[in-house]
Amino acid sequence: GSTVPPMVNVTCSEVSEGNITVTCRASSFYPRNITLTWRQDGVSLSHNTQQWGDVLPDGNGTYQTWVATRIRQGEEQRFTCYMEHSGNHGTHPVPSGNSHHHHHHHH
């Protein structure tokens, strides 16, 4: 099938002991090969500081996955989710303030 770019969605969890969990979800993409990783100041975090979900079919002939990491509250602006898929790439910031959702579709 033809390439379908992912929809990327960044969310923050509730604060716990001064930390928040930020999750980056990629959905509705094809083919299934994708790079999804958190970056701090532009540099990728190590694998052992991130959690990945499996790349799973979403029932529409496309796929979905996620990556999460814990960061200190107040340092959200230093972190971005980096996505690479079928030669396209994008960088997605952690939402600031009270806006806890950020969606972007890659074309």
């Epitope: 100041d41 540099v43 190590s46």
Partner: antibody, heavy 122, light 112 residues
Framework: QGQMQQSGAELVKPGASVKLSCKTS????????ISWLKQKPGQSLEWIAW????????SYNQKFTAKAQLTVDTSSSTAYMQFSSLTTEDSAIYYC???????????????WGQGTLVTVSA | DVLMTQTPLSLPVSLGDQASLSCRSS???????????LEWYLQKPGQSPKLLIY???NRFSGVPDRFSGSGSGTDFTLKISRVEAEDLGVYYC?????????FGGGTKVEIK
């Protein structure tokens, strides 16, 4: 590699503001992190802040949060730093520099502008 | 903030000599991702700094192999195996592992 061309020298009065520019060419502007740095005559360098051109996201050295404001204009591939409430302590050369990242590898200030001399004097 | 201390302040050399520059950080500068982002820059009079070494020991593109970096933890060294005239200037070490990113005070390499 690309180029980073900074605006010309500025002579400003105490209390005023100045907006410095860093026009880039030869690379994909929106993919890059750009930092601004300060160097007083005969002294070492200080990192002020970075801006990610793709989103406009910034991170500041706390020492400069009330002093500097970074912005970008993607249509002209130009980064800006506005420096406010200037004092004689702000007299320095200000550099823009581009980061060069590859995953967990990479260099912080791989490519530099030529610098802009800012003189604060009554 | 991480304090970066460079020694010596001035290093007089003869052309062709080996030069050794030291940089010490006030705390361990291993990044959260396990890498050590210690860099060396050379600034010649009236010029912008130029990157020589990144991640402790990696030469940046176009940097001659007479420059080598080493070290770990808090102690780092830049060696110039045979000093040439174009190597004269002020050398700065820099850490990019902990915000705010910080530079050392510099070592001036000059002719003896």
């Amino acid at each position: 590699q690309g180029q980073m061309q900074q605006s010309g020298a500025e002579l400003v009065k105490p209390g005023a503001s100045v907006k410095l520019s860093c026009k880039t060419s030869g690379f994909t502007f929106s993919d890059n992190y750009i930092s601004w740095l300060k160097q007083k005559p005969g002294q070492s360098l200080e990192w002020i802040a970075w801006i990610y051109a793709g989103t406009g996201g910034t991170s500041y050295n706390q020492k400069f949060t009330a002093k500097a404001q970074l912005t970008v204009d993607t249509s002209s591939s130009t980064a800006y730093m506005q420096f406010s409430s200037l004092t004689t302590e702000d007299s320095a050369i200000y550099y823009c520099a581009r980061h060069d990242y590859y995953g967990t590898s990479g260099a912080w200030f791989a490519y530099w502008g030529q610098g802009t001399l800012v003189t604060v004097s009554a | 903030d991480v304090l970066m201390t460079q020694t010596p302040l001035s290093l007089p050399v003869s052309l062709g000599d080996q030069a050794s520059l030291s940089c010490r950080s006030s705390q361990n500068i291993v990044h959260i991702n396990g890498n050590t982002y210690l860099e060396w820059y050379l600034q010649k009079p009236g010029q912008s700094p130029k990157l020589l070494i990144y991640k402790v020991s990696n030469r940046f593109s176009g940097v001659p192999d007479r420059f080598s970096g080493s070290g770990s933890g808090t102690d780092f060294t830049l060696k110039i195996s045979r000093v040439e005239a174009e190597d004269l200037g002020v050398y700065y070490c820099f850490q990019g592992s902990h915000v705010p990113w910080t530079f050392g005070g510099g070592t001036k390499v000059e002719i003896k």
